[in-house]
Interface confidence: medium
């Protein structure tokens, strides 16, 4: 062994462990024949106090006893909780150049006596588990503190276990390693916890319990479900349980749900029938167990069983809409569209749709199946046609949904009045209207249909629509509505055999267009100028264009330009103006206006009319 303290010793009175607020005396003594050579009287012993490796105090002034050149005693007070290091050094005062030499050191631990442990609680997990107890230790002692857990019961049963707390680990739980069996169900057991450290000891109050108080059954295992006759709504949930279980709690929910269905089952013996399941739905099932109807604790929830219920035939009605386009004098193209059933109606994976087009009088029938949500056919323009669509999964088909094919905008008397479209926010548009004024027949329903006004949208994109009851005069449209895009919105009024419609354009948010129209040509005809232009590219329109403005002024003039404003029509791309002087060179340009404002000007064109003055 190497002796770090070969020069002397350091001792502490009353002990190296003291209660908070107490003082201690530290004595530093030199061994015989150690010290400053030849001059024992020049030996000076000093005591240094370190906290976390930092020298915080030279205790020279705390010296309470001194045997010159041999030993010194220092009193230390106001020590903080935890550990403090004291090092004694020898200073040979006749040799100023040599630093003090370490003699020895000591650590003093400051702490508190343990408080009585409280809130003892014991559990035994499962009939074959072991008893484990936990408690609240109270205030931190800052010292190594031993805890003893003692259990006593009938037939002189005694058992104890120990653990300790220090600044590295906490002891507030112990497993006694013994098993209480159900035949002791009525017996009473007592546990207490004793805490002891260098500054004192304390005991908890005795805690009394019975077998039923502390035994928590193991969670059920091997959970499975059997669907009766492959039913999607009825199934028998089965599981394994410990033998003594008398009560179970079942909980189940669709995976995307936030609330559980709860069921209590008494004496279920590992089996329970469920009758209210949704077909073709991912469910999560869990079970908990209890050993006694009134007392005892519930087990933890079992591991989840996740499974999908079987399919059942679809229910509900498909939402169908259509478009008619005349091809020539005796043929028309019918495009049928329908919306997918929601999962609770589809009740399985929709494999295909059965589509039927029937001419009522001649009994001509066209039938097909498709996996898509649209179907197009060319049929004669004559006759009264009706369409029906049904959805099929592996278990069957939904009832067909019928719709009469009428001329959707054929009857002016059925056209809704005062149609307006107002932007509500970035994602939707409020459409309102008044009923037709002089309808021959009663309106059965309104259809609000909308489509982005962009090139090819009629052929590329299916329409979006909403069915509105006949007593409603408004609709909030939001499906596929994006800001800064103009939509053509049609409100159809449908009777049994006729249709009328009104059209309006609308947007959910708008800005001034990015650019103005591009003037492509200026031509002179019969003393009038015709201005031709190309429309602003779709992405640059940034909403519904309300009108175009044509500006002109004499070249080199500083006067305000003249202008005419044209109501926007998608089909129009030229306009006449007739107030220009002949043989005067003019500069012309155009802008576009949305509800948010006017675009920058488009290209400028110069033109000098040749005709007579108007």
């Amino acid at each position: 062994n190497i002796d770090v303290c070969k020069l002397g010793t350091v001792t502490v009175q009353p002990a190296p462990v003291i209660p908070l607020g107490s003082a201690a005396n530290i004595s530093c003594s030199l061994n015989p024949k150690q010290g400053c050579s030849h001059y024992p009287s020049s030996n000076e012993l000093i005591l240094l106090k370190f906290v976390n490796d930092v020298l915080v105090e030279n205790l020279h002034g705390k010296k309470v006893h001194d045997h010159t050149g041999h030993s010194s005693t220092f009193q230390v007070t106001n020590l903080s909780l935890g550990m403090t290091l004291f090092v004694c050094k020898l200073n040979c005062s006749n040799s100023q150049k040599k630093p003090p030499v370490p003699v020895c050191g000591v650590e003093i631990s400051v702490g508190v006596a343990p408080e009585p442990p409280q809130n003892i609680s014991c559990v035994q997990e499962g009939e074959n588990g072991t008893v484990a107890c936990s408690w609240n230790s109270g205030k931190v002692t800052y010292l190594k503190t031993n805890y003893t857990l003692q259990l006593s019961g009938p037939n002189n049963l005694t058992c104890q276990k120990q653990c300790f707390s220090d600044n590295r680990q906490n002891c507030n739980r112990l497993d006694l390693g013994i098993n209480l069996s159900p035949d002791l169900a009525e017996s009473r057991f007592i546990v207490r916890v004793t805490a002891i450290n260098d500054l004192g000891n304390s005991s908890s109050l005795p805690h009394t319990f019975t077998f039923l108080d502390i035994v928590i059954p193991l969670p059920p295992w091997d959970i499975r479900i059997n669907f009766l006759n492959a039913s999607g709504s009825r199934g028998t949930l089965q599981w394994e349980d410990e033998g003594q279980v008398v009560l179970n709690q079942l909980r189940y929910q669709p995976l995307n749900s936030t609330s559980w269905n709860m069921v209590n089952a008494t004496n279920a013996k590992g089996k329970y029938d469920l009758r209210d399941l949704r077909p073709f739905t991912e469910y999560e099932f869990q079970i908990s167990s209890k050993l006694h109807l009134s007392g005892g604790s519930w087990s933890n929830w079992s591991e989840s069983l996740r499974t999908r219920t079987p399919e059942e035939e679809p229910v509900g009605i498909l939402d169908i809409w259509y478009m008619k386009q005349d091809i020539d004098y005796d043929r028309q193209q019918i495009s049928l569209f329908w919306k997918s059933l929601n999962p609770s109606e589809a009740r399985g994976k929709i494999l295909h749709y059965q589509v039927t087009l029937q001419e009522v009088t001649k009994k001509t029938t066209l039938q097909n199946t498709t996996r898509h949500t649209s179907w197009t056919r060319v049929i004669p323009r004559t006759g009264a046609w009706t369409a029906s669509v049904s959805a099929a999964n592996s278990k069957g088909a939904s009832a067909p949904t019928h719709i009469n094919i009428v001329d959707l905008c054929g009857t002016g008397l059925l056209a809704p009045h005062q149609v307006s479209a107002k932007s509500e926010n970035m994602d939707n548009i409020l459409v309102t209207w008044q009923p037709p004024k002089k309808a021959d027949s009663a309106v059965r329903e309104y259809i609000v249909e909308w489509r982005a006004l962009q090139p090819g949208s009629i052929t590329k994109f299916p329409p979006h629509w909403l069915r509105i009851p006949p007593d409603n005069m408004s609709a909030l449209i939001s499906e596929n509505i994006k800001p800064y895009i103009c939509y053509e919105i049609r409100v159809h009024a449908l009777s049994e055999s006729q249709g009328g419609c009104s059209s309006i354009r609308g947007d959910s948010k708008h800005k001034a267009p990015v650019s103005g129209p591009h003037i492509t040509a200026i031509t002179e005809k019969k003393e009038r100028l015709f201005i031709s232009w190309t429309h602003i590219p779709f992405p640059e329109q940034r909403g519904c264009i309300l009108h175009y403005r044509i500006y002109w002024k004499e070249r080199d003039s500083t006067a305000q330009p003249e202008l005419c404003e044209i109501q926007y029509r998608r089909s129009q791309n030229s306009h006449p103006i007739s107030s220009l002087q002949p043989r005067v060179t003019y500069v012309l340009w155009m802008t576009a206006v949305t509800a948010a404002g006017e675009s920058p000007q488009g290209n400028e064109r110069e033109f000098c009319p040749q005709g007579k003055a108007n």
Epitope: D3, D53, E107, N167
Partner: nanobody, 118 residues
Framework: QVQLQESGGGLVQPGGSLRLSCAAS????????MGWFRQAPGKEREFVAL????????YYADSVKGRFTISRDKVKNTVYLQMNSLKPEDTAVYYC???????????WGQGTQVTVSS
Amino acid sequence: QVQLQESGGGLVQPGGSLRLSCAASGRAWNEYNMGWFRQAPGKEREFVALIWWSSGNTYYADSVKGRFTISRDKVKNTVYLQMNSLKPEDTAVYYCAAGPTFNKYEYWGQGTQVTVSS
């Protein structure tokens, strides 16, 4: 079986740095002090630095104070000695030791050679 295993020694130029490691295994060290000692050829083994495993308090020989730093990693059960501004007189075999009090060491490692030379 209790074991202290030093590593990290080697040849270094004056003014250079080295980091020694001492891996402690075979028991709980919570109530122990861990120290570094060194022994130069023909000299007695001398104390270098000390750390209390539980509190992390440290203590150094005056000859290394400000140049050497002792630390410990409780998770890895390892004590380190970071040696900076090394001098030729720091040349020695460095030993790791463990003991229950300030001046008593029960377990020793095999040592690792540190040579400071240009």
